[in-house]
Every structure is written in C-alpha cells, then in structure tokens.
C-alpha cells in the first residue's frame, strides 16, 4: 500500500538538490580563499539536518543554527548591497564591482539561491513532489525560514552606508512585505549604519520621472528615519548604461547622469 504523502501547493525540491548544494559549496570555497577551511560535506550535513525528518510547516531559525555557524563569513560591512525584486541586475552589478556583496555573493546565499527544498515529518526522505507555498500553505517552511534567517544576519552585519537596489517598474517600488521590507530594513543596526541609500532602477527608456518621490519610497524613508538612520535616494534612469559605466568608469559618456 503506497504511503499517503502530503500534497503541498508549491513546487517540489529542486532535482538533484544534495549534489547541487555540494557542488556549489566546492566551487565557492575554491574561489574564495577565506572560505577554504570550510568542509562542504559538513555544510551539506548541517543543511540537511535543518529540514530532514521535520514537518515542513514547523521549521524554525534554530533548525538552521548549525548551518549558520559553519557558514559564518566576514564580508566588508560597508560594502553591502541589498535588493528587492531586481535580483539579476544586483548580481550583474556585484559580478563587475567585485568589492560589493549581495547576500547571494556569500557562501550561504550562493548555496541556496534559486533552489527549493523540503522534507517530510518522520522520514528521511526529501520531497521532490511538492513543498509548502508561503501564501497558500505556511510561512514557516524550510525555504522561507532559511532566507529570513540569512537575510536578518546579513542586515545585522551591515555598517556605514548600505545600498539597496529597488525595481522602479513595480507598482510598489518599496514593498513592506518583501524580504527587504519585512526583515532587512528592521535589522539594520542604527549604531553601525549611518545611511541607507536606495537606487531606484527605471525600466522604460523614456521614463524621466523622479521615482525617489514615489509614495512607497517616502514610506521607506519614514521607516528608516524613525530608526535613526539617514536615507538617500538616486534614480538610475539607464540601468544598461549604469552597468557599462561600472565596467568602464573612464568612458567619457559616464560623467553624465545615468
């Protein structure tokens, strides 16, 4: 008789999840000399231990503590780039501007980005069929709790001027319900962080509006100011030119506004 299996609303664990995490870990530790001491098998064991045999709607930040400990990493606290709903441009930026870091440029973020995972209560199986959806099923699922945990720690580590890239094409440029709006904003430490600088990325070629005046940006400014952190905002009218100028800052066209 086949065992009854919970059917969740979200996609199942990414195919070959264990091998993918292990291979990403090996790559990361080879490229980043400061992480060469990390034992990737232990990292995988700690990752697995956070969700295997546990109900996928009952995961806690504590479950991930062994993994957090193994993945402890010091990034320059004044070189942090947060992002919301514009991940790929943020990653393109840090792949060129190598001294700045998104969460996905850290070991733990790199291991998990774009992957899905969950287990089943009381069995050692990984569920490749379905995993809980944050909205339709539960918020305390393995993926959501992981990102909440690493995002909180990343924001807590930030200092001086923290940058955030926001998507100016969305109806809510700043969304209080995003990871940035619900976790990272509230975990910046006012005693360490002097300024949050938002970069609002424009989508349309002819869009010359000042999106820094958008009501949701004003809402972000209010939240940040109440936390005794200064706020500044820049429009990035031409993201393609912006990236080009990061690559070639001496280009004569890079002195004008981007």
């Amino acid at each position: 008789v086949p065992r009854w299996r919970q059917q969740w609303s979200g996609p199942g664990t990414t195919k070959r999840f264990p091998e993918t995490v292990l291979a990403r870990c090996v790559k990361y530790t080879e490229i980043h000399p400061e992480m060469r001491h990390v034992d990737c098998q232990s990292v995988w064991d700690a990752f697995k231990g956070a969700f295997i045999s546990k109900h996928p709607c009952n995961i806690t930040e504590e479950d991930y503590q062994p993994l957090m400990k193994l993945g402890t990493q010091t990034v320059p606290c004044n070189k942090i780039l947060l992002w919301s709903r514009i991940k790929d441009l943020a990653h393109q930026f840090t792949q060129v501007q190598r001294d700045m870091f998104t969460l996905e440029d850290t070991l733990l973020g790199y291991l998990a980005d774009d992957l899905t995972w969950c287990g089943e209560f009381n069995t050692s199986k990984i569920n490749y069929q379905s995993c809980p959806d944050w909205r339709k099923d539960c918020s305390n699922n393995p993926v959501s709790v992981f990102w909440k945990t690493v995002s909180r720690r990343f924001a807590e580590a930030a200092c001086d001027v923290v940058h955030v890239m926001l998507n100016g094409s969305r109806s809510k440029i700043f969304d209080k319900n995003s990871t940035f709006g619900s976790v990272e904003v509230h975990n910046l430490q006012p005693e360490k962080v002097q300024t949050l600088e938002a970069w609002v990325i424009h989508g349309g070629r002819e869009d010359s509006r000042d999106l820094c005046q958008d009501p949701t940006i004003k809402e972000l400014e209010s939240i940040i100011s109440k936390r005794n952190i200064q706020f500044s905002c820049k429009n990035i009218y031409r993201p393609d030119k912006f990236l080009q100028c990061v690559k070639n800052p001496e280009d004569s066209s890079c002195t004008s506004e981007i």
Partner: nanobody, 126 residues
C-alpha cells in the same frame, strides 16, 4: 527573461578555427554546468561538450575530443567553445544550454530549461 545567446559561428575552411561564445542574460551562469550541443543537417541534436560549475571538470564527445576546448568566464556570464582543426563533419548549428545539475555526467547533459536559443551556424567548407 532567462536566455542564452550563442555567437561566433561562420564559414571556415577545413583545418581552420572558430571560437563560439554563449552568453547568459536574466540569470547567473555560475549556478550551472553548461553544455554545448550541435545539430548537423538532417541529424538529431547531440551534446558535444560540457563544463561543470567549478570550470575544473570538462567532458567531450569522441568526435571533438582533442580539437575542441570548453571554458568559462563567470564574471562575463559567458562560456566559450574553442574549435580547432575543423572538419566538414563539424558543420551544423551550435547551441548551448545550462545543465540540470552543477556537474557533467559523461555527456548525459540534461537541460534545466528548454528555452533553446537561436544557435550559431558553423559551416566548414573549402
């Protein structure tokens, strides 16, 4: 959107060389093993080379072994295929695609998303 764009093809004489490029947009190339595939006229598309996410492990099909070299530059989001000593049998459309997994298992490259690019035409002719 997520896509890979192949370029660098052309018409070349037997014994000549070409360097193909495969550039990612909309996603991070450094999360994937990448395979190069070729479709010769009237034949099935076949995997000819693969590079794992570390760039340290590569695989080649028998027909291209020793003549073709695959490499990657993750900062440029590009994978290259250096093709030397080209033969008439190398004629075809060349495609690249991300593998479903971070490693290359022989050349059993399972593609992680099937939005194939346009490919780049390579013609080897005197």
């Amino acid at each position: 959107q997520v896509q890979l764009v192949e370029s660098g093809g052309g018409l070349v004489q037997p014994g000549g060389s070409l360097r193909l490029s495969c550039t990612a947009s909309g996603f991070r190339l450094d999360y994937y093993a990448i395979g190069w595939f070729r479709q010769a006229p009237g034949k099935e598309r076949e995997a000819i080379s693969c590079i794992d996410i570390t760039g340290m492990h590569t695989n080649y099909g028998d027909s291209v072994m020793g003549r073709f070299t695959i490499s990657r530059d993750d900062a440029k989001r590009t994978v290259y295929l250096q093709m030397n000593s080209l033969e008439a049998e190398d004629t075809g459309i060349y495609y690249c695609a991300p593998a479903q997994y971070a490693a290359c298992s022989a050349l059993g490259v399972k593609v992680s998303f099937t939005s194939w690019g346009q490919g780049t035409q390579v013609t080897v002719s005197p």
